[in-house]
């Protein structure tokens, strides 16, 4: 399938987004302009935007301006000057700032522990699918469906470090080699990114907020599937990781470490187990073809066990079957050996909510899904809101001058090695990339950090996780040392590898564009973020999978005209960009295939068509609910009262011309009165972060 | 104490089917062997088969394999023998007898033994 | 099957006398895990049969030390010093070495 039209507006020009850039950003026109730029990407940027009702002037924005969609917005101080404030004044705004930053404590808080639920949840509903996936006996031979599984698995279970722990147990077990475990490393990394993605799918609301954060999420899914897309290949054909790894570990005589600190679990658990308890090697034992453990539930019941150690005479088929000759005997009918059992007593139950349910593990997994998923939801739109009434003004400025601006020259270009570093401390730290890069997500969708600084800090989490996933293999028993460690350091070594191909060079930094593009897309249709992540974490995973059950030969015979036809496509989309004239006049542009393969338009009408109900029934009480229907229907005329979706009924009407947005003006809180949002008297009570 | 209660006699027509009890208390049911024996009147015994009530595993004589059923049920600490297709033969005094399997094979308790007499 | 002769069939005695029981076996009843699981057992009328020896001459706990087994292979003796009434009864030997476990056809103890 050709690209769409939009692609071809959606970055004019691709190396703005450098690194370099960063620091010295021009200042953005306001969210809603950028609203309405991606409203209608084919509108020519310089077209003078029509005047709201109650505006004075005609405003011309410059050209430059509203040329990248990208740039920070300004976040306007409305409020009253420090300096100017009286003492009553300051005493009031700093236990606001005070209590501003403990409701944002709280409400990070929970955000993280409702991650945890979260990656519990998808545990119970598929995490028993998951360990079946494992216990495929294709993986030691096709590395492909070693990828998928681990994508699969990974999205499933929402823990790579889970899907990893399997992994080594197996390898460790004999029942995988390292060489069948790398591709389902490569596809556990691929889908914990799946995580942050999710995270920025509950910015829908806002257009300009949306794409920042979808991209921002999406850089690291780019960067994962890129990764893959080269080190599968290099791996399957050097087996470099392997070799390296092994080299490794064969050339140090490790002792047993001590466990990996658990930092935030230490927080989070206190909480997060009084709502659900798992038992993880549930899961491991399905994948070891545990048969006991299918019927297992992964609800925790028991807390507290004694476990006996006692020999028990047990009958064996004959004499060669006795665990060793002296512990055989007969009694003349049967033959007999002694046999080590471990016998489980329970004495304390567990303390969490479903502990005396007895419901299905489905049930349970359900009911933590949805209401973890709300609670996530929840405190992203208070985090964002707090961040938001916080971050403006000197504040703005100065965080964002701090995290965006990079070092003088000649040093520039280490300031994105250092935030690779304070990203790999910061997963250190919070023991997990999901949840460090799922509180990158809003800041990026506010504007706190470009995406260009985001791509660096998301890298370093991936080798934070995995200098995690190192110390917890030190800390592993003697048996599964060996093989623990060097999965952990093939991981390692997987994605410095893809750091070295996509972010040395600017060039190469094809992820940032990638997800920039997506997120123009994602935000002028914002159905084809959740199709995007239906695709790209479900389907091909899936469909990959089924065609590798199948056999060789189908998957190479589907595969070799599918990868034929994307190879295809891309060298003429290069060539469409950078050399047209080598092309014959009717390749030169997309327009020889019919509108259905080449633009999102007609695909936007039938989805539209589908959740024509939705819109309808659309809910402007409940923000969350809200949301969740902007995401489906492009409503532009629900939520208004929400402020959460800001289509104007001109959008909808297909009005090329672009309506200045109230935004513009100097003061926000102007603005939110003319639309009736702010009631007037409250405009002056707006406190300027400390 | 150590004990091992049979079922009373039985008076059953030739042909029919008769099921005999063994109620054993005072010691761990599941650990010991549940043997059979046949005594015809005024002859000498003869070893029917026997039950592990632990893993419900038989051994029979194949003598008998076709005329009796070995069975045992651990929580009410009993074994069955059930007789089938009954002859005058088959008129007996049955014992069930605990087999000792540990160190040194023996049978050191039995039951009082029950009557089974089959006549038209 | 292992075919178990006792003699002599009967065994008239007086209380107080010395009593031989013998027990010949068809083949040898040495197991392969090299016991001799022979037996002796003494039934009592309208009683059901009780231990007397075990391993061919292992007494069971509470018999009189008046009861001694001897003999291995093939030939096997039970006896008896000092008959006394109590002793009166059916005697039967047991192999159970070979399957089918087999009894003797009995020596009835007497008295003169």
């Known amino acids: 399938m050709a690209p769409w039209p939009e692609l071809g507006d959606a970055q004019p020009n691709p190396d703005k987004y450098l690194e370099g850039a960063a620091g010295q950003q021009p200042t953005a026109p306001d969210k809603s302009k950028e609203t309405n730029k991606t409203d209608n990407t084919e509108a020519p940027v310089t077209k003078i935007e029509l005047l709201p009702s109650y505006s004075t002037a005609t405003l011309i924005d410059e050209p430059t301006e509203v040329d990248d969609p990208w740039n920070l917005p300004t976040l306007q101080d409305s409020g009253i000057k420090w300096s100017e404030r009286d003492t009553k004044g300051k005493i009031l705004c700093f236990f606001q700032g005070i209590g501003r930053l403990i409701l944002l404590l709280g409400f990070l808080y929970f955000f993280v522990c409702s991650l945890d639920i979260l990656s519990s949840a998808f545990q119970l509903v598929g995490g028993k699918m998951a360990g079946q996936f494992f216990s495929n006996s294709s993986i030691m031979s096709n590395p492909l469906l070693g990828l998928v599984i681990g994508v699969l698995v990974t999205v499933l279970v929402q823990s790579s470090s889970t899907s990893t722990s399997i992994v080594v147990s197996m390898v460790s077990s004999s029942l995988l080699t390292v060489r069948a475990a790398i591709p389902i490393i490569m596809g556990a990394n691929i889908g914990t990114s799946i995580t942050n993605t999710i995270v920025a799918l509950m910015q829908v609301g806002d257009r300009s907020e949306f794409r920042r954060a979808f991209a921002g999420a999406t850089v690291h899914d780019f960067f994962n599937w890129l990764s893959v897309l080269v080190l599968l290949p290099v791996e399957v054909a050097t087996h470099y990781l392997e070799i390296i790894t092994q080299l490794i570990v064969e050339s140090f005589h490790f002792k047993n470490g001590e466990d990996a600190p658990d930092l935030l679990k230490v927080i989070t658990k206190p909480f997060t187990k009084l709502i659900v308890q798992l038992d993880k090697k549930v899961i491991s034992q399905i994948a070891m073809n545990d048969e006991k453990a299918k019927n297992k539930s992964l609800v925790k019941i028991w807390c507290k066990t004694f476990t006996n150690k006692t020999q028990i005479n047990v009958t064996v088929p004959s004499t060669a079957n006795c665990t060793s000759p002296s512990l055989c005997w007969t009694d003349g009918i049967q033959n007999w050996t002694m046999k080590n059992v471990t016998y489980k007593e329970n004495i304390a139950k567990c303390q969490h909510i479903f502990v005396n349910f007895h419901l299905p593990d489905l049930a349970v997994g359900t009911i933590l899904l949805i209401l973890s998923l709300l609670v996530l939801c929840g405190c992203l739109i208070m985090i964002v809101k707090i961040l938001g009434s916080v971050l403006k003004g000197q504040v703005a400025t100065v965080i964002k001058k701090t995290i965006n601006t990079d070092f003088p020259f000649p040093f520039a270009w280490l300031t994105g090695y250092l935030a690779i570093l304070v990203g790999a401390g910061m997963t250190f730290i919070v023991q997990s990339s999901s949840v460090f890069t799922s509180a990158l997500t809003p800041l990026i969708g506010i504007g706190v950090i470009t995406i260009e600084r985001a791509y660096p800090l998301t890298l370093g989490s991936n080798i934070g996780t995995t200098t995690t996933a190192i110390l917890a293999a030190l800390a592993s028993p003697g048996n599964a040392l060996r093989s623990s460690l060097q999965i952990a350091l093939c991981h390692f070594f997987f994605n410095i590898s893809g750091i070295l191909l996509w972010y040395p060079i600017p060039f190469t930094r094809l992820p940032i564009r990638m997800a920039k593009g997506l997120g123009n897309i994602s935000a002028k249709y914002r159905w084809f973020a959740v199709f995007y992540l239906i695709i790209f974490f479900f389907l091909i995973p899936l469909t990959v999978f089924g065609l590798s059950l199948a056999g060789w030969r189908v998957l190479v015979g589907v595969g070799v005209p599918v990868v034929f036809i994307i190879i295809l496509v891309l060298c003429l989309r290069l060539l469409q960009s950078r050399c047209p004239r080598v092309l014959p006049k009717k390749l030169q542009n997309w327009n020889f295939l019919p509108l259905w393969m080449r633009s999102l338009k007609p695909w936007d009408a039938v989805v539209s068509k589908f959740t024509g109900c939705f819109q309808m029934r659309c809910c402007c009480c409940c923000r969350v609910c809200c949301r969740a229907c902007c995401l489906l229907c492009d409503c532009p005329k629900c939520c208004r009262c929400s402020k959460c979706c800001e289509d104007l009924e001109e959008a909808q009407e297909g009005q090329d011309v672009p309506v200045k947005a109230p935004e513009t003006f100097d003061n926000i809180t102007i603005s939110r009165e003319a639309q009736g949002e702010v009631p007037a008297s409250d405009s002056k009570t707006e406190c300027t972060a400390l | 104490q150590v004990h091992q209660q049979q079922s009373g006699p039985e008076l059953v027509k030739p042909g029919a089917s008769v099921r005999i009890s063994c109620k054993a208390s005072g010691y761990t049911f599941t650990s010991y062997y549940i043997h059979w024996v046949k005594q015809r009147p005024g002859q000498g015994l003869e070893w029917i088969g026997c039950?592990?009530?632990?893993?419900?595993?038989?051994k029979y004589n194949e003598k008998f394999k076709d005329k009796a059923t070995l069975t045992a049920d651990t929580s009410s600490t009993t074994a069955y023998m059930h007789l089938s297709s009954l002859t005058s033969e088959d008129s007996a005094v049955y014992f069930c007898?605990?087999?000792?399997?540990?160190?040194?094979?023996?049978?050191?308790?039995w039951g009082a033994g029950t009557t089974v007499s089959v006549s038209s | 099957d292992v075919l178990m002769t006792q003699t002599p069939l009967s065994l008239p005695v007086s209380l107080g006398d010395q009593a031989s029981i013998s027990c010949r076996s068809s083949?040898?009843?040495?197991?392969?895990?090299?016991?001799?699981?022979l037996e002796w057992y003494l039934q009592k009328p309208g009683q059901s049969p009780r231990l007397l020896i075990y391993k061919v001459s292992n007494r069971f706990s509470g018999v009189p030390d008046r009861f001694s087994g001897s003999g291995s292979g093939t030939d096997f003796t039970l006896k008896i010093t000092g008959v006394e009434a109590e002793d009166l009864g059916v005697y039967y030997c047991?192999?159970?070495?070979?399957?089918?476990?087999?009894f003797g056809g009995g020596t009835k103890l007497e008295i003169k």
């Open positions: 039950i592990y009530p632990g893993n419900l595993f038989t």
């Open positions: 007898a605990r087999f000792l399997n540990w160190n040194a094979w023996y049978f050191d308790v």
């Open positions: 083949q040898s009843i040495e197991h392969s895990n090299g016991n001799t699981n």
């Open positions: 047991f192999q159970g070495s070979h399957f089918p476990w087999t």
